[in-house]
């Protein structure tokens, strides 16, 4: 018979014949022959192959490097890679999440508009007139200036975007 030019799904062409691919979780040891089947071996510990394949080496599981703010979300198997995610207080640098960075803090004069998540950083906003923030924080919003009037006091020192107003007693009218 004519040697095949194409093979069925889960097969590959080698030496003018169709051999079975190795199943996920296994690597190729030797190609099939006229008389023998494809020989495959399971991937070792901390290795995987996630497709029907003819790879002679399995892939190493991804290392979730704590120095890059990563931790294991899902342990890999012989058929799947390890999935990493960010440590608490860190967020991914891209959609693929190959590394993480610490959430940014909002500087004094800025408040948190949106608290960071595992995939997005802190969003800061400048404190508008009437509000202040005197700390560097990843959680604190801008606080409103103290209302001296409601305490029956007067403003002794005006507030800024970084400082609260200073209240003091009203001057007594002398007789």
């Amino acid at each position: 018979p004519e040697p095949p030019t194409a093979c069925r799904e889960k097969q590959y062409l080698i030496n003018s014949q169709c051999c079975s691919l190795c199943q996920p979780g296994q690597k190729l040891v030797s190609d099939c022959t006229e008389f023998t089947e494809t020989e495959c071996l399971p991937c070792g510990e901390s290795e995987f192959l996630d497709t029907w394949n003819r790879e002679t080496h399995c892939h190493q599981h991804k290392y979730c490097d704590p120095n890059l703010g990563l931790r294991v979300q899902q342990k890999g198997t012989s058929e799947t890679d390890t999935i990493c995610t960010c440590e608490e207080g860190w967020h991914c640098t891209s959609e693929a999440c190959e590394s993480c960075v610490l959430h940014r803090s909002c500087s004094p004069g800025f408040g948190v508009k949106q608290i960071a998540t595992g995939v997005s950083d802190t969003i800061c906003e400048p404190c508008p007139v009437g509000f202040f923030s005197n700390v560097s924080s990843a959680f604190e919003k801008c606080h409103p200036w103290t209302s001296c009037e409601t305490k029956d006091l007067v403003v002794q020192q005006a507030g800024t975007n970084k400082t609260d107003v200073v209240c003091g007693p009203q001057d007594r009218l002398r007789a």
Epitope: H57, K62, T93, S94, V101, D121
Partner: antibody, heavy 113, light 108 residues
Framework: VKESEGGLFKPTDTLTLTCTVS????????VSWVRQAPGNGLEWIGG???????YYASWAKSRATITRDTNLKTVTLEMTSLTVADTATYFC??????????WGPGTLVTVSS | AFELTQTPSPVSAAVGGTVTIKCQAS??????LAWYQQKPGQPPKVLIV???NLASGVSSRFKGSGSGTEFTLSISDLECADGATYYC??????????FGGGTEVVVK
């Protein structure tokens, strides 16, 4: 990771370089391209993440295209409208938007009329 | 556009001495900074990740510090083999992935 051969190009030519990877899956790790003009510093061109998203330096957005073939285990950089200023050693490195711990040896691209 | 500025270059010191290289970001990148060493004819080698963490197999003579916009790489007990060009790299986001201009370290 290893880059394909560079070579001599003329101004206005299009450069195509291929990075071939082994020992890891492109579904697990991204690949980036970095270049270095003779006697100059490192310049990030762009990269492709493990999810297939491509990212580019602002200067390269209009001229560079990075694609991948997960089955062939290759990542391709195409750069159009070459000028003499594109003469450099081009490196591919494992990783998208991250730290690059594994680099290819680099390949020299010369643009000259 | 986002920039990383490295200073000074070149910097020289005697064997056994200490050198300090600075890297300044044009906007906050938290701790998303790495340091690399590159010798002529070779690709770069990563030394520090996350601004202050030693990469695997790197000598503890290398020390990274800083966060936000100001970062420092210090090399103590200098050896002849430390003569190289050092680069900082931001990886905070795709729009701020960039290398510094490099600092040449000369060991006398």
């Amino acid at each position: 990771v290893k880059e394909s051969e560079g070579g001599l190009f003329k101004p206005t030519d299009t450069l195509t370089l291929t990075c071939t990877v082994s020992g890891f899956s492109l579904s697990s790790y991204g690949v980036s391209w970095v270049r270095q003009a003779p006697g100059n510093g490192l310049e990030w061109i762009g990269g492709i993440g493990s999810d297939g998203s491509a990212y580019y330096a602002s200067w390269a957005k209009s001229r560079a295209t990075i694609t991948r073939d997960t089955n062939l285990k290759t990542v391709t950089l195409e750069m159009t409208s070459l000028t003499v200023a594109d003469t450099a050693t081009y490196f591919c490195a494992r990783g998208g938007i991250t730290v690059y711990a594994i680099w290819g040896p680099g390949t020299l691209v010369t643009v000259s009329s | 556009a986002f920039e990383l500025t490295q200073t000074p270059s070149p910097v020289s010191a005697a064997v056994g001495g200490t050198v300090t290289i600075k890297c300044q970001a044009s906007q906050s990148i938290s701790n998303g900074l790495a340091w690399y060493q590159q010798k002529p004819g070779q690709p770069p080698k990563v030394l520090i990740v996350g601004a202050s963490n030693l990469a695997s197999g790197v000598s503890s003579r290398f020390k990274g510090s800083g966060s936000g916009t100001e970062f420092t790489l210090s090399i103590s007990d200098l050896e002849c083999a430390d003569g190289a060009t050092y680069y900082c790299q931001s990886y905070f986001s795709s729009s701020s992935t960039v290398f510094g201009g490099g600092t040449e370290v000369v060991v006398k």
